[in-house]
């Protein structure tokens, strides 16, 4: 846990038959059928993997 990998999702958008590919810092959100910024997953027993506020961890392309 903690490492980000290239995510290639098999989910298909409502308007396209092409599988959605997301870059390293994104994941496919089926709600909006798009690649979106994705945080590191955490579980109740391990807590956050980062001490940063949720929603701000490991996003080098976003301004501080």
């Amino acid at each position: 846990m903690g490492a980000r990998r290239l995510r290639v999702r098999s989910q298909r958008s409502r308007d396209s038959s092409v599988p959605t590919q997301c870059n390293q810092t994104e994941c496919f959100d089926p709600l909006v059928r798009n690649c979106v910024s994705c945080e590191l997953f955490h579980t109740p027993d391990t807590g956050h993997t980062s001490s940063l506020e949720p929603g701000t961890a490991l996003q080098p392309q976003e301004g501080s």
Partner: antibody, heavy 125, light 107 residues
Framework: EVQLVESGGGLVQPGGSLRLSCAAS????????IHWVRQAPGKGLEWVAW????????DYADSVKGRFTISADTSKNTAYLQMNSLRAEDTAVYYC??????????????????WGQGTLVTVSS | DIQMTQSPSSLSASVGDRVTITCRAS??????VAWYQQKPGKAPKLLIY???NLYSGVPSRFSGSGSGTDFTLTISSLQPEDFATYYC?????????FGQGTKVEIK
């Protein structure tokens, strides 16, 4: 610090229009989805619309389809809700919210993690 | 659209009680369910996402479980600040839909 601030609410007559704004700070809206959720007085939460500012994709609740338009200006880091042909039943507090996705074995584990303070829209003659 | 049916619509409980709120989806939503707490005049606050994951800063007395169509929010020992209205929400498919809410009142 992540913050969402709504503005633009007020009193409007039936059939009138309003434009709500949702100014975001502490994160970039272009890589998220932004949602509008409303709450009529004494009632529950009702999702209204979402937008992915990166590509302009949108979706709407049936109750507002054709009357409301969600948009975003990534240069201003702000989302908007243009509300036309307003009805008495549109009277509510309108919240904007940011959806977060956590990477899990199932893909995106998502929810609305940050909400604005809300802006009251009253439709009355 | 996916309907989310919450029960009960309201309940009365005492400090220290164990409280359980359930939410049933009209179709399979996997684990794409979140729970929110709302107090009068305030915006909702996220408690649980992904059906069972505790959001940052939320006390560990809150827990969520379930997958598919049946979901539960449990407060293991009710505290004075927990008296509020709780909502479930599915985000498996658009439109995202909320349950009608459960108001937790003081007995």
């Amino acid at each position: 610090e992540v913050q969402l601030v709504e503005s633009g609410g007020g009193l409007v007559q039936p059939g009138g229009s309003l434009r709500l704004s949702c100014a975001a700070s502490g994160f970039t809206i272009s890589r998220r989805s932004i949602h509008w959720v409303r709450q009529a007085p004494g009632k529950g939460l009702e999702w209204v619309a979402w937008i992915t500012p990166s590509d302009g994709n949108t979706d709407y609740a049936d109750s507002v389809k054709g009357r409301f338009t969600i948009s975003a200006d990534t240069s201003k880091n702000t989302a908007y809700l243009q509300m036309n042909s307003l009805r008495a039943e549109d009277t509510a507090v309108y919240y904007c919210a940011r959806r977060v996705c956590y990477s899990s074995v199932r893909g995106c584990a998502g929810a609305m993690d940050y909400w604005g303070q809300g802006t009251l829209v009253t439709v009355s003659s | 659209d996916i309907q989310m049916t919450q029960s009960p619509s309201s309940l009365s409980a005492s400090v220290g009680d164990r409280v359980t709120i359930t939410c049933r989806a009209s179709q399979d939503v996997s684990t794409a369910v979140a729970w929110y707490q709302q107090k009068p005049g305030k915006a909702p606050k996220l408690l649980i996402y992904g059906a069972s994951n505790l959001y940052s800063g939320v006390p560990s007395r809150f827990s969520g479980s379930g997958s598919g169509t049946d979901f539960t929010l449990t407060i293991s020992s009710l505290q004075p600040e927990d008296f509020a209205t709780y909502y479930c929400q599915q985000s498996h498919a658009s439109p995202p839909t909320f349950g009608q809410g459960t108001k937790v009142e003081i007995k």
